[in-house]
């Protein structure tokens, strides 16, 4: 459950992949579209804004009481929208909703190598975003051989700016 | 109750080498990433390795890259670090440390061990 | 790697005093800094993470502030019990960096 219903902090971000490409947001008919695009020199990056939240792992293994706590966050490119993992398609997508928000925009923070982060869906352990022909899309992980998977990395880039959402 | 032992601290020649263990308790050990951090006599806290829950990913310093290895045994909730080639710039208490985070680092370590001294001297 | 500056490197201070020390990152860490205490022979303790979120156990006497690069921890009335070495810590990315400490001494 997540222990407080405030985020611990927020961040205005431009999301990028391992490989330096561009995430980002366009409005199309009524719906926005997340792209994942080399980016030309003089364009702005998208800005998302993270909100992170605490959250205490569900269970315990080991019977102790003390099972550590997770980061989650949410990502909200445009005001009232959030990214939200629909894992019936194994699609990323963009929805409008109120707060409080589903369990579908909370991911578990992951750091790694190359001091890159991923984000593993909160209603479905094991599935991550990832980068799948030239879009977002949850991608399976195998915990044994793929935790360093290049398509499930992703950049933050700090835009300094105060926090207020973007419109 | 939450608490980390580190042993395995020594004196040792220049060129020799430790191997410090860590042993926790009070948590859950495999979900947690770990770290060892050392403070050397009349200085500052230096960050040494850190390494994932499940052992699978490894971080070290530059100073101390290539000369010490960092693992773990989930089975006995024991923490490692493996010196090789101690010079008298590793003379230093030496802390294990949980992560506040399970799976990431932006929450600094929220419990820590008291201490291992290794001193290297010839 | 990113570089950690606390200010000042040692401050005398009473008991009752307000009390800051700064930190400054080398390059933006957003709001990845955590405080810590240390005493003689006892190992760190955490105060603050997330630059300003309180760690459970620590009294409300200590905060934190700031976020990119520059950051604050500030003791409101300091107790006895405070007398210490400090150091902040970029939690942002590995290599992990600390500062050089700030020895708290009774004036």
């Known amino acids: 459950s997540i222990t407080g219903i405030s985020p611990i902090t927020e961040s205005l971000a431009s999301l990028s992949t391992y490989n330096d490409q561009s995430i980002t947001f366009a409005l199309e008919d009524e719906s926005y579209e997340i792209y994942v695009e080399d980016l030309k020199k003089d364009k702005k990056k998208d800005k998302v804004l993270l909100s992170y939240y605490e959250s205490q792992h569900p269970s315990s293994e080991s019977g102790d009481g003390v099972d550590g706590k997770m980061l989650m966050v949410t990502l909200s490119p445009t005001k009232d929208f959030w990214l939200q993992a629909n894992n019936k398609e194994h699609s990323v997508e963009l929805h409008k909703c109120e707060k409080p928000l589903p369990d579908q925009a909370f991911f578990v923070l992951h750091n790694r190598s190359f001091n890159c982060v991923s984000f593993e869906c909160k209603t479905d352990p094991g599935v991550f975003i990832g980068v799948k022909d030239n879009h977002l899309a949850l991608i399976k992980v195998d915990y044994s051989e793929n935790l360093g998977s290049e398509n499930i990395l992703f950049k933050l880039s700090e835009i300094l700016e105060h926090h207020h959402h973007h419109h | 109750e939450v608490q980390l032992v580190e042993s395995g601290g020594n004196l040792e020649q220049p060129g020799g080498s430790l191997r410090l263990s860590c042993t926790a308790s009070?948590?859950?050990?495999?979900?947690?990433?770990m770290n060892w951090v050392r403070r050397a006599p009349g200085k500052g806290l230096e960050w040494v390795s850190g390494i994932s829950g499940s052992g699978g990913r490894t971080y070290y310093a530059d100073s101390v890259k290539g000369r010490f290895t960092i693992s773990r045994d989930n089975s006995k909730n024991t923490l490692y670090l493996q010196m090789n080639s101690l010079s008298a710039e590793d003379t230093a208490a030496y802390y294990c440390?949980?992560?506040?985070?399970?799976?990431?680092?932006?929450?600094?370590?929220?419990?820590w061990g008291h201490g291992t001294t290794v001193t290297v001297s010839s | 790697d990113i570089q950690m500056t606390q200010s000042p490197s040692s401050v005398s201070a009473s008991v009752g005093d307000r009390v800051t020390i700064t930190c400054r990152a080398s390059q933006g860490i957003f709001s990845w800094l955590a405080w810590y205490q240390q005493k003689p022979g006892k190992a760190p303790k955490l105060l603050i993470y997330?630059?300003?979120s309180l760690q459970s156990g620590v009294p409300s006497r200590f905060s934190g502030s700031g976020s990119g690069t520059d950051f604050t921890l500030t003791i409101s009335s300091l107790q006895p019990e405070d007398f210490a070495i400090y150091y902040c810590q970029q939690a942002n990315s590995v290599p992990i960096t600390f500062g050089q400490g700030t020895r708290l001494e009774i004036k």
């Open positions: 997330a630059a300003s």
């Open positions: 440390a949980k992560d506040s985070y399970t799976t990431s680092w932006y929450g600094g370590m929220d419990v």
């Open positions: 009070g948590f859950t050990f495999s979900r947690s990433a």
